[in-house]
């Protein structure tokens, strides 16, 4: 996968101090790169703002669960 070699790496250096309502969240992605100082979750809000959050916090894990369950393929 040569294209990924020089791909830019997004890192989080600080985490949000406040809990974000799940109604404001649209998606998330995880950051695990060894080039970053810490593992992180980046939430994208419904207004396309990106927010770094601590994956060890329960509200962050609950929010990720909520987003994943929200997008389950409906049973026919």
């Amino acid at each position: 996968q040569p294209d990924a070699i020089n791909a830019p790496v997004t890192c989080c250096y600080n985490f949000t101090n406040r809990k974000i309502s799940v109604q404001r969240l649209a998606s998330y992605r995880r950051i695990t790169s060894s080039k970053c100082p810490k593992e992180a979750v980046i939430f994208k809000t419904i207004v396309a703002k990106e927010i770094c959050a601590d994956p060890k916090q329960k509200w962050v894990q609950d929010s990720m669960d909520h987003l994943d369950k929200q997008t389950q393929t409906p049973k026919t």
Partner: nanobody, 124 residues
């Protein structure tokens, strides 16, 4: 560097059981949802089961519901797949993966860091 190593596959007769294990390293395991997928020769990768970081929420493919159980031991950085009442159509290479993006648990693009897989063969 994130690494996933599966084990526990093998040859089993129809109706038998196997327990697969996937050991993860290089990440804070307990904060990641994990999934099991399988791929049979000539077929697309198929979702089997997934579990959230804390182990409180699981989801299964219809084809394995009631027969397979996914679980995890965060102290051992390991996710398991207990497979009972195996059928010949369960024959495939089984791989675990780390969920990295929001979206349906059953969607492979939501996952990254795939293990090399372990072969499960069910004979009739």
């Amino acid at each position: 560097e994130v690494q996933l190593v599966e084990s526990g596959g093998g040859l089993v007769q129809a109706g038998g059981s196997l327990r697969l294990s996937c050991v993860a390293s290089g990440l804070t395991f307990s904060t990641y949802s994990m999934g099991w997928f399988r791929q049979a020769p000539g077929k697309e990768r198929e979702f089997v089961a997934a579990i959230n970081g804390g182990g409180s929420s699981t989801t299964y493919a219809d084809s394995v519901k009631g027969r397979f159980t996914i679980s995890r031991d965060n102290a051992k950085n390991t996710v398991y797949l207990q497979m009972n009442s195996l059928k010949p159509e369960d024959t495939a290479v089984y791989s675990c993966a780390v969920k990295m993006y929001s979206g349906s648990y059953s969607s492979p693009p939501g996952y990254n860091y795939w293990g090399q897989g372990t072969q499960v063969t069910v004979s009739s």
